[in-house]
Amino acid sequence: MAVTACQGLGFVVSLIGIAGIIAATCMDQWSTQDLYNNPVTAVFNYQGLWRSCVRESSGFTECRGYFTLLGLPAMLQAVRALMIVGIVLGAIGLLVSIFALKCIRIGSMEDSAKANMTLTSGIMFIVSGLCAIAGVSVFANMLVTNFWMSTANMYTGMGGMVQTVQTRYTFGAALFVGWVAGGLTLIGGVMMCIACRGLAPEETNYKAVSYHASGHSVAYKPGGFKASTGFGSNTKNKKIYDGGARTEDEVQSYPSKHDYV
């Protein structure tokens, strides 16, 4: 029972994690314009892995895709690759784990096969989670580096007369979604690996013992019967309440009700 619960929970946690990785990969807010200690602009910039967006204070938002491969920074390409690898591995892991679930019976699949599949999906989830965490962390590191570089050259004077304020970018919501999602996928994978150990059939060989009774020759062979949780095990209906994760497109919507500018 504990094995089934661990496997089921691992599957659900990984499923949520992979959904989060997909959401983070698609989100536009990987980096958002830094508002702290900056002149107040009526334009808010934010960037994702696939496009950059500008939201004017009027509410008008314009997004432009990065319609180039060669012109993009290698780091951005690496982050994209890591996230996609994470999604692909996670998706395959989910597919494998569905068939590995103890509560699902497919033909006459052996417990050992289910155990192997559970381990395989667990490893896939772990690698998927690590890919997502690595991708998000590489991007975050890139942001931190650029942030301090742009702070150092924040005002590039033209003959001391005209000042050009450089737009600085800070962590966007997608980074936090990615970190959490990657962590969940990783935890789910570990849980699947733990469940695999409980699923593997123990090789307990009982020697057949013959009892010679008077008159009859009856051989009792104690069969290796196992207590198994049946298909119709008494599992209560559980409702999973999704907290309704929303993508914050309003990140900048000007902080307080009354601003003096």
Epitope: Q33, A42, V43, N45, V54, T164, V261
Partner: antibody, heavy 119, light 113 residues
Framework: QVQLQQSGAELMKPGASVKLPCKAS????????IEWLKQRPRHGLEWIGE????????KYNVKFKDKATFTADTSSNTAYMQLNSLTTEDSAIYYC????????????WGQGTTLTVSS | DIVMTQSPSSLTVTAGEKVTMSCKSS????????????LTWYQQKPGQPPKRLIY???TRESGVPDRFTGSGSGTDFTLTISSVQAEDLAVYYC?????????FGSGTKLEIK
Amino acid sequence: QVQLQQSGAELMKPGASVKLPCKASGYTLTGYWIEWLKQRPRHGLEWIGEILLGSGSIKYNVKFKDKATFTADTSSNTAYMQLNSLTTEDSAIYYCARKGLRGNSFDYWGQGTTLTVSS
Amino acid sequence: DIVMTQSPSSLTVTAGEKVTMSCKSSQSLLNSGNQKSYLTWYQQKPGQPPKRLIYWASTRESGVPDRFTGSGSGTDFTLTISSVQAEDLAVYYCQNDYYYPFTFGSGTKLEIK
């Protein structure tokens, strides 16, 4: 079509307060920023601030922090600007304008209210 | 605050002539995110409120005659009227709509001979 109606003229005494209306027709105020501007002959145009109807978000030019207060009544589709402690320096034409959906600039303007502060 | 400097303060031309007026800002109005400059040109005729002619430095407002052209980027901007008409008699203002508080130039008064 979009129109912003303002009262024609106001004559006030120094130290008094005045509430200038800006009634929108042809569109719903909610979701648009209403801008308030001041124009004096030798001072050009000055931006006082803006109010986003529906959200209650307000931005004031720090120069007018203690002078202007913005309010709105969505039921009558009207925005208001109250000017306190009037002085002769407040004598000007006050415009309300709507911030357009593109470019952060003002696509429709009221005809303006001429405020005269005189004892 | 951003300072907007317009020149000349006034100019007198004959109908049909080409006119250019300049506007400079103390800081760049170019947004790196979309490579647009947040500068607007307004026309104010006597006794009327200002009317938007050009936004994003070069995008003409619908209904504005194509003799009006805005150009420039960053800190230097120009409004050109290719062939001045009698009805163009007005004061032309440029406005920073990138930084708060929004600021206006002192205006260029166009007079027709």
